[in-house]
């Protein structure tokens, strides 16, 4: 058993049929010695008396809010949560496996630049009685500070018969140099509590590996005389690290119709303009990627050919 | 100060072309190592990230773009020793910091070159003959060093009398290649920045 936060405790349980469970001793936070009784949740049934209560925790029915009272007055609470371990593996029931970039990916993180700011998100099908707490650091043995905000519900989607909820959090490394060469990864830890179930999820990464620039901005077209070619120009996204001559991007320019199966024109360039062949009912799209370290491409910025 | 975004002709700054070749060569070598040593811990997640130039050179700090010198977090270990005369320096007006930056890059290359050559000598003794360093990568390191043209003491190649542990050598190769790729990215960024300046 360990303390998650004040008056909230996590009991780690090996989860299998007829498991013996864990013996837990609760102590009432009071100077009083006599006349103390214990109850669980909203029940008025007295579970025991005395300053301490010893319980055998085996299942979710044994978890919950234990309260010690004296003469009708509440003295203190202890909330017990369960953390299940099945076949030596901690349960991952609360969050959905996003399977990208690999299986058992519960947390996904992205950074728009090298400033040390990043966003992580996760998915769940659970809609109520759900709380998250996020901590982060650079390195684990001698951790350096990363500050994370509160996790918020950022999107809701319908997937078949199920509703899917996306939560996200923003974090900022306390003293980040955009030009630094990372040798210690960022660690992100998410505590998830659903009703009386506790789970924790972690992700470890270098900022350089989670870079995904914003799409290029200000796409403009200029038809070339006596030609089917069009000059397309754009600018670096505002959120990208500066100076741009140091943090350079490379671009992919594509002309395609509405369907991905349609024929297309595609060209890669380090410049902020390119010449392509425009077709009726097609769109010109441009995306960006770090020129020197190939992490993710940005989303497309698009303009219609016409 | 708004610096140009498009990459000018590499001929304007001879080191830019060589640094691009360096990044390409080390990336190819790392990819080859990951494929060939697929049953060794050779991915970024599996290896320890060591920097053999740590406390010996200060490339990131010495080569910091002017725009980032206002960032306190970038200035914790800025070094100031005076080194002059590299052939990549475009004019006499070149600042002292630029000379320091390029000499730091030169020292990095020299250290990695020695490490890679020592390692290659060991790998050539491996009866499995599983992996060797790409001669192209070693040549590209040499070309960039020549373009930088700093006078520097020769570092003797390390020779080891004991029987090499080939498993450890291959893991060390992965660690070295990962670190060198990150440094090659920095070098490429620096050359691009200097070229645009």
């Amino acid at each position: 058993i360990w303390e998650l936060k004040k008056d909230v405790y996590v009991v780690e349980l090996d989860w299998y049929p007829d498991a013996p469970g864990e013996m837990v001793v609760l102590t009432c936070d009071t100077p009083e010695e006599d006349g103390i009784t214990w109850t669980l949740d909203q029940s008025s049934e007295v579970l025991g008396s005395g300053k301490t209560l010893t319980i055998q925790v085996k299942e979710f029915g044994d978890a919950g809010q234990y309260t010690c009272h004296k003469g009708g007055e509440v003295l203190s609470h202890s909330l017990l949560l369960l953390h299940k371990k099945e076949d030596g593996i901690w349960s991952t029931d609360i969050l959905k496996d996003q399977k990208e970039p690999k299986n058992k990916t519960f947390l996904r993180c992205e950074a728009k630049n090298y400033s040390g700011r990043f966003t992580c998100w996760w998915l769940t099908t659970i809609s109520t009685d759900l709380t998250f707490s996020v901590k982060s650091s650079r390195g684990s043995s001698d951790p350096q500070g990363v500050t994370c905000g509160a996790a918020t519900l950022s999107a809701e989607r319908v997937r078949g018969d199920n509703k899917e909820y996306e939560y996200s959090v923003e974090c900022q490394e306390d003293s980040a140099c955009p030009a630094a060469e990372e040798s210690l990864p960022i660690e992100v830890m998410v505590d998830a509590v659903h009703k009386l179930k506790y789970e924790n999820y972690t992700s470890s990464f270098f900022i350089r590996d989670i870079i995904k620039p914003d799409p290029p901005k200000n796409l403009q077209l200029k038809p070339l005389k006596n030609s089917r070619q069009v000059e397309v120009s754009w600018e670096y996204p505002d959120t990208w690290s500066t100076p741009h001559s140091y943090f350079s991007l490379t671009f992919c320019v594509q002309v395609q119709g509405k369907s991905k199966r349609e024929k297309k024109d595609r060209v890669f360039t380090d410049k902020t303009s390119a010449t392509v062949i425009c077709r009726k009912n097609a769109s010109i799209s441009v995306r960006a990627q770090d020129r020197y370290y190939s992490s993710s491409w940005s989303e497309w910025a698009s303009v219609p050919c016409s | 100060r708004n610096l140009p975004v498009a990459t000018p002709d590499p001929g304007m700054f001879p080191c830019l072309h060589h640094s691009q070749n360096l990044l390409r060569a080390v990336s190819n070598m790392l990819q080859k190592a990951r494929q060939t040593l697929e049953f060794y811990p050779c991915t970024s997640e599996e290896i320890d990230h060591e920097d053999i130039t740590k406390d010996k050179t200060s490339t990131v700090e010495a080569c910091l773009p002017l725009e980032l010198t206002k960032n306190e977090s970038c200035l914790n270990s800025r070094e100031t020793s005076f080194i002059t005369n590299g052939s990549c320096l475009a004019s006499r007006k070149t600042s002292f910091m630029m000379a320091l930056c390029l000499s730091s890059i030169y020292e990095d290359l020299k250290m990695y070159q020695v490490e890679f050559k020592t390692m290659n000598a060991k790998l050539l003794m491996d009866p499995k003959r599983q992996i060797f360093l790409d001669q192209n990568m070693l040549a590209v390191i040499d070309e960039l060093m020549q373009a930088l043209n700093f006078n520097s003491e020769t570092v003797p190649q390390k020779s080891s009398l004991e029987e090499p542990d080939f498993y450890k050598t291959k893991i060390k190769l992965c660690i070295l290649l990962h670190a060198f790729r990150i440094r090659a990215v920095t070098i490429d960024r620096v050359m691009s920045y200097l070229n645009a300046s």
Epitope: K263, F268 | P10
Partner: antibody
Framework: QVQLVQSGAEVKKPGASVKVSCKAS????????LHWVRQAPGQGLEWMGW????????ESAPKFQGRVTMTTDTSTSTAYMELRSLRSDDTAVYYC???????????WGQGTMVTVSS | EIVMTQSPATLSVSPGERATLSCRAS??????LHWYQQKPGQAPRLLIY???QSISGIPARFSGSGSGTEFTLTISSLQSEDFAVYYC?????????FGGGTKVEIK
């Protein structure tokens, strides 16, 4: 599978014209861009131009502008390349090539040998 | 127009050996470069597109790298069926242009 079958060899006199055909099968002609590439005996490859069979848009290399005409007949899934004012240095194997991407060539015809000789 | 230069013109290699073919562009073309193989009496065949992207059905021994002005096609272990002429082609701008080819012959 996607295939391009070209017309047979031709022998032409200098100053004449030649029209080479290229029949597409295994796909709809309008779904791919179609290019013409030639290769003189013992020489390398030379790109001549492209056509978009969907709308008839064409672009040819400056060297061939005014001398080459590229057309398609979607009803027969056939593309044509006509080269006029033939010279002896036009002697080459002429290939049609197609791709969903405009700028490189995924599928090739077997080639048509055109000999220009007096 | 962009001029593509391939080297060497002829490469003599023993079966099982590694072959490295070079292609240089007269100006920077990013990764807009493609490689083809041509055997005598046959049409060319696409091997690699956009400098390093592999084609399904093409053996894994063929790999491409490079960007900007310098590109490499590597055949890791030459098989008898790999002896042919190899062409690079730029798609950075029109007109599309090919290199002069590298003939890989048996040593």
């Amino acid at each position: 599978q996607v295939q391009l079958v070209q017309s047979g060899a031709e022998v032409k006199k200098p100053g004449a014209s030649v029209k080479v055909s290229c029949k597409a099968s295994g796909y709809t002609l309008t779904d791919y861009y179609l290019h013409w590439v030639r290769q003189a005996p013992g020489q390398g490859l030379e790109w001549m131009g492209w056509i978009d069979p969907e709308n008839g848009d064409t672009e040819s290399a400056p060297k061939f502008q005014g001398r080459v005409t590229m057309t398609t007949d979607t009803s027969t899934s056939t593309a044509y390349m006509e080269l006029r004012s033939l010279r002896s240095d036009d002697t080459a194997v002429y290939y049609c090539a197609a791709n969903k991407e405009l700028r490189y060539f995924d599928v090739w015809g077997q080639g048509t040998m055109v000999t220009v000789s007096s | 127009e962009i001029v593509m230069t391939q080297s060497p013109a002829t490469l003599s290699v023993s079966p099982g050996e590694r072959a490295t073919l070079s292609c240089r562009a007269s100006q920077s073309i990013s990764i807009n470069l493609h490689w083809y193989q041509q055997k005598p009496g046959q049409a060319p065949r696409l091997l690699i597109y956009f400098a390093s992207q592999s084609i399904s059905g093409i053996p894994a021994r063929f790999s491409g790298s490079g960007s900007g002005t310098e590109f490499t096609l590597t055949i890791s272990s030459l098989q008898s069926e790999d002896f042919a002429v190899y062409y690079c082609q730029q798609s950075n701008s029109f007109p599309l242009t090919f290199g002069g080819g590298t003939k890989v012959e048996i040593k």
